[in-house]
């Protein structure tokens, strides 16, 4: 990119219509016959959706105003936010003694921005100051990108919480899940 990304310290998030559906119904799970039917969905932040393709790396559309100090864009910009999980849980339980350890059952993928686009926005400032033009970098698409255990913490921060996969032989902090831990991880699509 030949231009500097413009950092927005304050934005107003305006979710698009249709992003507030009713919560999903409870799923049934058989301990012996594990079934991953269409419709298994985890909670999403900040919204949930009934769309069966939801449990995946999804591109949520957000509309927001770009602000820079006292100045605000004349029109809101629409951008994508990458949301969701990339596949089933890839951690398998390892019972050692009385403690429960976890080990990976596959590479760890995270739903992250893939491509970006530049958009020029006009900022209106109070007190009759002249409008300013700025270029903002907006997410254009998302992908399920593989993480490695060699990613350092500063890199992981870019991928959001829960980005680090526990290494083999380590005892990780258990993930926060409800009583029915497996209910929320029944299906994905990439």
């Amino acid at each position: 990119q030949g231009w500097q990304a413009f950092k927005n310290d304050a934005t107003e998030i305006i979710p698009e219509l249709g992003e507030y559906p009713e919560p999903p119904p409870e799923l049934e799970n058989n301990k012996t016959m594990n079934r991953a039917e269409n419709g298994g969905r985890p909670p999403h932040h900040p919204f949930e959706t009934k769309d069966v393709s939801e449990y995946s790396c999804r591109e949520l559309h957000f509309t927001r105003y770009v602000t820079d100090g006292q100045c605000r864009s004349a029109k809101p910009v629409t951008e994508l936010v990458c949301s969701g999980q990339c596949g089933p849980a890839r951690l398998l339980p390892n019972a050692i003694g009385r403690g429960k350890w976890w080990r990976p059952s596959g590479p760890d993928f995270r739903c992250i921005p893939d491509r970006y686009r530049a958009q020029r926005v006009q900022l209106l400032c109070p007190g009759g100051a002249a409008p300013r033009a700025r270029k903002v970098r907006l997410v254009a698409s998302c992908k399920c990108k593989r993480l490695t255990r060699f990613h350092n913490q500063s890199e992981l921060k870019d991928f959001g919480p829960e980005a680090a996969r526990p290494q083999k032989g380590r005892k990780p902090r258990p993930r926060a899940r409800g009583a029915k831990a497996n209910q929320a991880e029944l299906e994905n699509a990439y």
């Epitope: 849980a89 596959g106 991880e185």
Partner: antibody, heavy 123, light 107 residues
């Protein structure tokens, strides 16, 4: 010996469903995610998705979303792949494959494959 | 999806020849590249993983190299049992994708 043994060939009509099984032996079934890959006649390989035998959690290639369901029966160490609304271009050999791991290089690969199940979709 | 392009799609060679197959990814896949060999009517077999790591039991005449987007599988001295189709596969981004295959035939 680590082995994946798949069910026999199937002939189906367009619009029907097929369910292919893959029985694992020689290793702890719940220790590895199972993947499914297909190969149309004279074509390359196409990854369909994966399932975690512990949780039943599955992840599918978006191309097959809504038509495929992967399941496991841990009591018999068997994985299943059901494909619905079959079309003629679903005619292919369907493989189950185990995802192996190299701890040193933190890398994954399909190290054990089933022998393949031929599914023919024809009216 | 990441496109994996193999070249050539087929080649004719003789026993003892040095054979090189290339695989190009449409975007950077680091070293997450595997190579498989498939013979007619059989399932694919893993040869090389993580670009250059030879699976135990695979003859040392097979080698892999590359990183980022360009990768190579080399057979230093082709043997009769090596006539087959070879596929590359990326493991960097979901969905996993394979190359179109390179068929190695007897000249």
């Amino acid at each position: 010996e680590v082995q994946l043994v798949q069910s026999g060939a199937e002939v189906k009509k367009p619009g029907a469903s097929v369910k292919v099984s893959c029985k694992a032996s020689g290793y702890t079934f719940t220790d590895y995610n199972m993947h499914w890959v297909r190969q149309a006649p004279g074509q390359g390989l196409e990854w369909m998705g994966e399932i975690n035998p512990n949780s039943g959690g599955a992840g599918y290639n978006q191309k097959f979303k809504g038509r495929v369901t992967m399941t496991t029966d841990t009591s018999t160490s068997t994985a299943y792949m059901e494909l619905r609304s079959l079309r003629s271009d679903d005619t292919a050999v369907y493989y189950c494959a185990r995802l192996g791991y190299d701890d040193i290089y933190d890398d994954w690969y399909f190290d054990v494959w089933g022998q393949g199940t031929t599914v023919t979709v024809s009216s | 999806d990441i496109q994996m392009t193999q070249s050539p799609s087929s080649l004719s060679a003789s026993v003892g020849d040095r054979v090189t197959i290339t695989c190009r990814a449409s975007q950077d896949i680091s070293n997450y590249l595997n190579w498989y060999q498939q013979k007619p009517g059989k399932a694919p077999k893993l040869l090389i993983y993580h670009t250059s790591r030879l699976l135990s039991g695979v003859p040392s005449r097979f080698s892999g190299s590359g990183s980022g987007t360009d990768f190579t599988l080399t057979i230093s001295s082709l043997q009769p049992e090596d006539f087959a189709t070879y596929y590359c596969q990326q493991g960097d981004t979901l969905p996993y994708t394979f190359g179109g295959g390179t068929k190695v035939e007897i000249k």
